[in-house]
């Protein structure tokens, strides 16, 4: 997260870190007691490596009492996402049991509604993400606030020049913005998901390249079908 | 434990090129930026570039550009500085560093005929 | 580009001294690092982010500033403390650094 602070400690019981040999790869967002939803591309930089999801995190270093990590029984990328795409960028985590619940767990209510959040809301996004354009990753969750932007003017030609989708969304990126690591993680406006972080490689913070998340709301079927 | 390893001390010829290594352990260079940066003892410290491991972009300090260019191997988390048409001028201790929090031990380049 | 000037160049400390280094900017940049290089050693970081200490980093240092003007704080001084600090700015590219302080002992 570059240009934000850091989160009021278990604030976001929604939040994940999904791991690979222990250490943070990208953000994730508890959506049901056994289900965490990422980003697809997270995958592809796993590699043979030991996927894990880490719930009940503030600080990723830190002994904290409502921290656990969780295998991954079964991991369902979209069935559309590619690797030379942001297009369907979402993955289904299984857990390997359902989590224990408490106040610093619990899923995050995901918009089933397919309509566009009104350009201007402020919409919380959080990670563990890299804080600096020097590459600095944070030891404690941050977030930031993030204005919507209208798809017609992410599309311009000085911006994402038409490759942004029905299914997703844009946010503001003039210095505040999501970054490397913290892709897969939730977009939230008015305490509900709207977004997931996509994971491309996107140059952050830069006003002229706004930041793209998945909209939740155009695969809820999908979505459904999974965790069903 | 974060460590940068970096490749031995090179004495080259005027006009010649030369490719230092740094080889990461403790974390995954995908996962962040790494720099490169120069010492030497009438310029100081001054940053060469940095790339983004996972999809090779780098930025550069325009005085670096044609003169440095940074790589990566992921598969062997390892970075390269490879400096070209050297001088008198680039004789210099040579770091890598991770995010700009770690830094390597440093190789020194000679450069003299 | 953001040109850092670092004062005194030179300075010295006694034991216990409370020291002062200062770096300034020819224009407003938003965030400072700063390192301590011993002699023969790489350079570690010591404060990101203006104020923020590095990890392993003694408390006696703090970092301060804003726009134009920074400065590192040794509350007491150390022996071990005796080492040339650089300034580093991360709001324009290139990214520069100061020309350093050379800190001694007394």
């Known amino acids: 997260i570059l240009g934000g602070r850091e989160a009021e400690a278990h604030a976001r019981p929604y939040m994940a870190s999904v791991q690979v040999n222990g250490e943070h790869l990208c953000g994730g967002v508890l959506v049901a007691e056994q289900w965490v939803l990422s980003a697809a591309h997270c995958l592809e930089d796993a590699a043979d490596g030991k996927v894990q999801v880490l719930l009940g995190a503030h600080s990723l270093s830190q002994p904290e009492p409502s921290k656990r990590l969780y295998d991954v029984l079964r991991a369902v990328p979209h069935p559309d996402s590619r690797p030379d795409t942001i297009d369907h960028d979402l993955l289904l985590l299984q857990l390997s049991e359902k989590a224990t619940l408490g106040p610093a767990v619990r899923p995050l209510p995901w918009q089933r509604v397919d309509r566009d959040v009104e350009p201007g809301t402020l919409c919380d996004v959080a990670g563990w993400g890299i804080v600096s354009h020097a590459g600095r990753r944070p030891d404690r969750l941050q977030h930031v606030l993030l204005p919507v932007l209208d798809r017609a003017t992410c599309n311009r030609r000085t911006h994402h020049d038409g490759a942004i989708t029905q299914r997703m969304m844009c946010a503001e990126s003039n210095r505040r913005d999501s970054c490397k690591g913290d892709s897969g993680g939730p977009l939230v406006c008015g305490g509900v998901l709207e977004g997931v972080v996509t994971s491309g490689s996107r140059v952050c913070g830069n006003r002229k390249k706004p930041g793209i998340y998945t909209r939740v709301a155009s695969y809820a079927a999908w979505i459904d079908s999974v965790l069903a | 434990e974060v460590q940068l390893q970096q490749s031995g001390a090179e004495l080259v010829k005027p006009g010649a090129s030369v490719r230092l290594s740094c080889t990461a352990s403790?974390?995954?260079?995908?996962?962040?930026?790494m720099h490169w940066v120069s010492q030497r003892p009438e310029r100081g410290l001054e940053w060469i570039g940095k790339i983004d491991p996972a999809n090779g972009n780098t930025k550069y300090d325009p005085k670096f550009q044609g003169k440095a260019t940074i790589t990566a191997d992921t598969s062997s988390n390892t970075v390269y500085l490879q400096l070209s048409s050297l001088t008198s001028e680039d004789t210099a201790v040579y770091y890598c560093?991770?995010?700009?929090?770690?830094w390597g031990q440093g190789t020194s380049v000679t450069v003299s005929s | 580009q953001s040109v850092l000037t670092q004062s005194p160049a030179i300075m010295s400390a006694s034991p216990g001294e409370k020291v002062t280094m200062t770096c300034s900017a020819n224009s407003s940049v938003s965030d400072m690092y700063w390192y301590q290089q011993r002699p023969g050693s790489s350079p570690r970081l010591l404060i990101y982010?203006?104020?923020n200490l590095a990890s392993g980093v003694p408390v006696r240092f703090s970092g301060s500033g804003s726009g134009t003007s920074y400065s590192l704080t040794i509350s007491r001084m150390e022996a071990e403390d005796a080492a040339t600090y650089y300034c580093?700015?991360?709001?324009?590219?290139?990214?520069?650094f100061g020309g350093g302080t050379k800190l001694e002992i007394k």
């Open positions: 580093q700015q991360w709001s324009t590219y290139p990214w520069t």
């Open positions: 560093l991770n995010a700009m929090e770690y």
């Open positions: 982010d203006t104020s």
């Open positions: 403790g974390f995954n260079i995908k996962h962040t930026y």
